[in-house]
């Protein structure tokens, strides 16, 4: 490797440290090195080595303390089940290669919970969930034996305990001991055995973290009955007074490094964004630390619940702020959190016991000073009266999430700090900061929030429909007349909003094809609902060949759409979803939404067009201020409108106008774009304000969009604020919460 030519700033030679089949990189200014292997391989016998004061690298020792002469990259294997109760697994093997499958089967009288088939993944973990054969005889259900662990205890009565342990050399993550609790749930969280080379994939972390965080945020009433043996989901009442504090604790020590610190900041910005998207307004505390902690935002500050302001503070933090004192004192950092939680003069304020506390710690897990931080977690639990009363343990009031980043993470340390809750994961180990950034991109848009409107997956790996998941393609086949292409927008699980002119009264439902999410299959149509005031021939007598007022229609689907990352609704004006999306108070009125989305000025907006089979966003400006009049007057250049005396005859108050060259040269819509949404993008959310209706100039005559277009090339869109009574009536059963 090229490294053999360089000499680290530390005092260890790089002679002979190479790894067979891989490479290495220096960490901590040459005081440590990390072996790097190709995907599907891991460094044997160790992943990292430290430069000792004697000037030599730490020895290559196997798990059973044998010394190895040279490091090598070995194929990653998944562990075998050490035991499986009340059933069998096949095939048998000492270990399983990546992509090998294992199947579980239960004996008569036992039901399989979890995954019957699991596949060995490239990170050395099994896909799916722990397979458990249970006969429902216990007060609690069988907690199972996660692959690679061993369980002691097979009685599942109230207050019975089971303990887990790992084979030599593996670290237990999760709970070593779990107790069967009142209500039929197990204390703690499912354990797993981790090898040093094992990392959580971004997808695993995003799913697990988000589903746990959602449990905390999306609170519903806890008075939910559940019988013994049922899995009890954590249910939380969030009272509207903003009873949640989130403490973001960021390691800024030497071992983290500047680029990782910047990456971690990005992750937390995404997290704040995500939480805001749920429509809750927690108070934030923001702490960075090295040798000493620095509190940037206190939960007691007036603006601590203003997500935008907290994000601004976070963005202004510099890694250099801790440069002079760059140890890792996690204990002191958590003490800073404790100080924010505690109350002056030890007098608890009104409602202290209804506040949920979430600590999110990002670290490389290497505290090297100040003592064991777990003691502070214990103090916090005491302060919040958690785990003291068996009848009301209050575990829901504290969640500690720990993100360990990089090869030096001490798994035992981070596991000790993290919360342990049934069916949830609070401790994560990711390979590097790029992986953690991936997590937070994925998390910004994961399963629990699929019903949120106007959310997209802006990640670099996303497809067209990840980025425009509401976009629908519509085509109408007319025998002997060819076919008409239009666009539309998914607005609910049963409805697509589009333009009325895409259809004629003679079009039959079976001749209308709608596809969403980039899927090849067409959706079955139940009915097309036109706005009752739409009549394309309404002004023929007045010499206006085509009249597009109220040019909107709703397509009702026969079957409910299954939301996913590539199919989800856009936000509609004057709905509760849009109030939350814009982070406005719940008392916001329709008029206030209108002022926010369509102020009297040039409004930056976008539409989605298909070019060469790719969906692209086109940025335009809605002329809603001083340019509105001239924009509308250009309608006279439209074919058939040249004889219109008063342009308001064709450009009614129902229209929004885009196009032209001022303030910028706007791209124009094409025929196939009709019916698609005109969108305002605000606060990382997408709100539909219009439906594309008609244009003055056909800029796409020969299947190609013309580059040079006249200044009078304008486009007109139906303003959704003007057709709200109709939308509200037709979508009344869709749970959109119209204001």
């Amino acid at each position: 490797t090229p490294w053999s030519l360089a000499r680290p700033q530390g005092s260890c030679s790089l002679e002979g440290v190479e790894i067979k089949g891989g490479s290495f990189r220096l960490l901590q200014e040459g005081q440590a090195l990390e072996y790097v292997c190709p995907s599907g391989f891991y460094p044997y016998p160790v992943q990292t080595r430290t430069c000792r004061s004697t000037g030599s690298w730490s020895t290559l020792k196997t798990q059973d303390q044998k010394t190895v002469r040279k490091a090598e990259c070995r194929a990653i294997h998944c562990p075998r089940p050490h035991d499986f109760e009340n059933g069998e697994y096949w095939p048998r093997s000492p270990y399983y290669n990546v992509s090998d499958e294992i199947s579980f089967h239960c004996y008569d009288g036992y039901t399989l919970r979890g995954s019957a088939n699991r596949t060995c993944q490239v990170n050395g973990r099994w896909s799916g969930q722990t397979a458990i054969c249970d006969n429902g005889a216990g007060y609690c259900s069988n907690p199972g034996i996660p692959i690679g662990t061993r369980k002691v205890g097979s009685q599942y009565r109230l207050e019975d305990s089971v303990t887990y342990h790992c084979s030599r050399g593996l670290t237990l993550r999760g709970s070593q001991r779990r107790t069967c609790q009142e209500g039929g749930s197990w204390s703690g969280t499912e354990p797993s055995c981790q090898d040093s080379f094992m990392y959580d994939t971004p997808q695993e972390v995003a799913e697990a973290f988000l589903s746990s965080l959602t449990e905390t945020i999306e609170g519903v009433d806890a008075e939910d009955g559940h019988g013994p043996g049922e899995q009890q989901k954590r249910k939380i009442v969030l009272d509207p007074s903003g009873s949640m504090n989130i403490y973001l604790v960021l390691d800024g020590s030497d071992s983290i490094g500047a680029s990782n610190f910047t990456g971690a900041k990005k992750c937390l910005v995404n997290l704040i964004e995500k939480v805001a998207s749920y429509g809750v307004k927690p108070r934030y505390g923001l702490v960075t630390y090295a040798t000493y902690p620095k509190i940037w935002v206190k939960v007691s500050e007036a603006d601590s619940s203003n997500a935008d302001w907290v994000t601004k503070q976070l963005n202004e933090i510099n890694y250099e702020d801790h440069k002079l004192k760059s140890g890792t004192n996690t204990k002191k950092a958590l003490q800073a959190v404790y100080s924010m939680m505690s109350w002056p003069d030890d007098v608890p304020p009104e409602g202290w016991n209804r506040t949920r506390h979430v600590i999110i710690l990002m670290t490389d897990g290497l505290h090297n000073m100040g003592g064991d931080p777990i003691t502070v977690i214990d103090e916090i639990r005491d302060l919040l009266y958690i785990g003291k009363d068996r009848k009301n343990p209050r575990e829901d009031y504290l969640d500690v999430y720990v993100f360990g980043v990089g090869p030096l993470v001490n798994q035992v340390n981070i596991n000790a700090l993290a919360s342990k809750k049934d069916n949830e994961q609070h401790v994560f180990k990711v390979k590097d900061m790029e992986n953690l950034e991936d997590v937070f991109y994925q998390m910004i848009d994961e399963s629990q929030s699929l019903s949120l409107c106007g959310m997209v997956w802006e990640h670099r790996k996303g497809t067209d429909y990840h980025k425009q998941p509401w976009q629908a393609k519509i085509s109408v086949i007319r025998p002997s007349k060819g076919h008409e292409s239009c666009m539309g927008a998914v607005v609910s699980e049963y409805f697509v909003l589009t333009a009325a002119h895409c259809f004629t009264v003679d079009d039959k439902e079976h001749s209308i094809k709608v596809s969403v999410g980039g899927e090849k299959r067409d959706l079955e149509i139940e009915v097309v609902l036109f706005h009752p005031n739409y009549n394309i021939n309404g002004k023929k007598e007045a010499g206006i060949p085509e009249f597009y007022d109220y040019d909107v229609a709703l397509i009702k689907l026969k079957n409910k759409l299954k939301y996913g990352q590539t199919i989800r609704p856009i936000c509609l004006p004057c709905t509760e979803g849009t109030t939350r999306a814009l982070r406005l108070p719940p008392t916001t009125t329709c008029q206030q939404q209108k002022e926010e989305l369509l102020p009297a000025q040039d409004i930056k907006a976008l539409f989605v067009s298909e070019e060469e089979k790719k969906l692209t966003r086109k940025e335009v400006y809605i002329k809603n201020g001083d340019k509105k009049g001239s924009c509308e007057r250009d309608a006279q250049y439209a074919p058939g409108y040249d004889k219109v005396k008063d342009i308001s005859e064709v450009v009614t108050p129902r229209f929004l106008c885009t196009g032209g060259v001022s303030p910028y040269a706007d791209p124009n819509t094409c025929r196939g774009d009709s019916g698609g949404p005109l969108i305002v993008h605000k606060r990382s959310r997408f709100i539909q304000v219009g439906v594309i209706s008609w244009g003055v100039v056909d800029v796409c005559k020969n299947q190609k969009r013309q580059k040079q277009v006249p200044a009078h090339a304008r486009d007109f869109h139906i303003n959704l604020f003007q057709v709200l009574p109709w939308l509200k009536e037709k979508l009344q059963d869709e749970d959109l919460g119209f204001l």
């Epitope: 050490h82 035991d83 499986f84 069998e88 697994y89 095939p91 008569d108």
Partner: antibody, heavy 119, light 112 residues
């Protein structure tokens, strides 16, 4: 009552073949993996083969691999052992045994059938 | 030559505690595979006595217990009785040669 009953044993010449059967009753046969274990006269137990509950996975001891075939017919609740190219050292009482649990403990045994390989 | 090594014989007087050892290697007990113990009374088929190192099937008295550590396992019988006179076999999965079950050579327990 859970029961296993072996049959098909007897005297056979070296190089000859024999097919053992094991009839299961009192439990859902198709749910369990099954084994053949043998015991030479005056000697200890020697495992021969195992077959998974659905017959998809089979493992043999080295001493019989290529000569013996374990199979099952779940519709008939029967386990089989087809023994070819028999040798004198295959002389033993052959037991069929049910496996239980992830570590394949043999919790139910038949009474055994004697196979004698001799010229 | 058995893969798992057991003493050929053991003895004890009624009421005494006896232990039978079973030594394996890194491909069976040492690899973490659980050990099972079987009892074979004279002229009968074997019977499962202990499974998964230390679990007792129903009907087996708690005088019988199993344990294991490293590459070996042991069966302990306390309060020895005359009806305990039998052959005892340990068994475990072994991951060599594509996987197989291996037995110990057996220990003949005599109650004096």
């Amino acid at each position: 009552e859970v029961q296993l009953l072996e049959s098909g044993g007897g005297l056979v010449q070296p190089g000859g073949s024999l097919r053992l059967s094991c009839a299961a009753s009192g439990f859902t046969f198709s749910s369990y993996s099954m084994n053949w274990v043998r015991q030479a006269p005056g000697k200890g137990l020697e495992w021969v083969a195992v077959i998974s509950y659905d017959g998809r996975f089979i493992y043999y001891s080295d001493s019989v691999k290529g000569r013996f075939t374990i199979s099952r017919d779940n519709s008939k609740n029967t386990l089989y052992l087809q023994m070819n190219s028999l040798r004198a050292e295959d002389t033993a009482v052959y037991y069929c045994a049910r496996s239980y649990g992830g570590n394949l403990a043999m919790d139910v045994w038949g009474q055994g059938t004697l196979v004698t390989v001799s010229s | 030559q058995s893969v798992l090594t057991q003493p050929p014989s053991a003895s004890g007087t009624p009421g005494q505690r006896v232990t039978i050892s079973c030594t394996g290697s890194s491909s069976n007990i040492g690899a973490g595979y659980d050990v099972h113990w079987y009892q074979q009374l004279p002229g009968t088929a074997p019977k499962l006595l202990i499974y998964d190192n230390n679990k007792r099937p129903s009907g087996v008295p708690d005088r019988f217990s199993g344990s294991n550590s490293g590459t070996s396992a042991s069966l302990a019988i306390s309060g020895l009785r005359s009806e305990d006179e039998a052959d005892y076999y340990c068994a475990a999965w072994d991951d060599r040669l594509n996987g197989r079950v291996v037995f110990g050579g057996g220990t003949k327990l005599t109650v004096l």
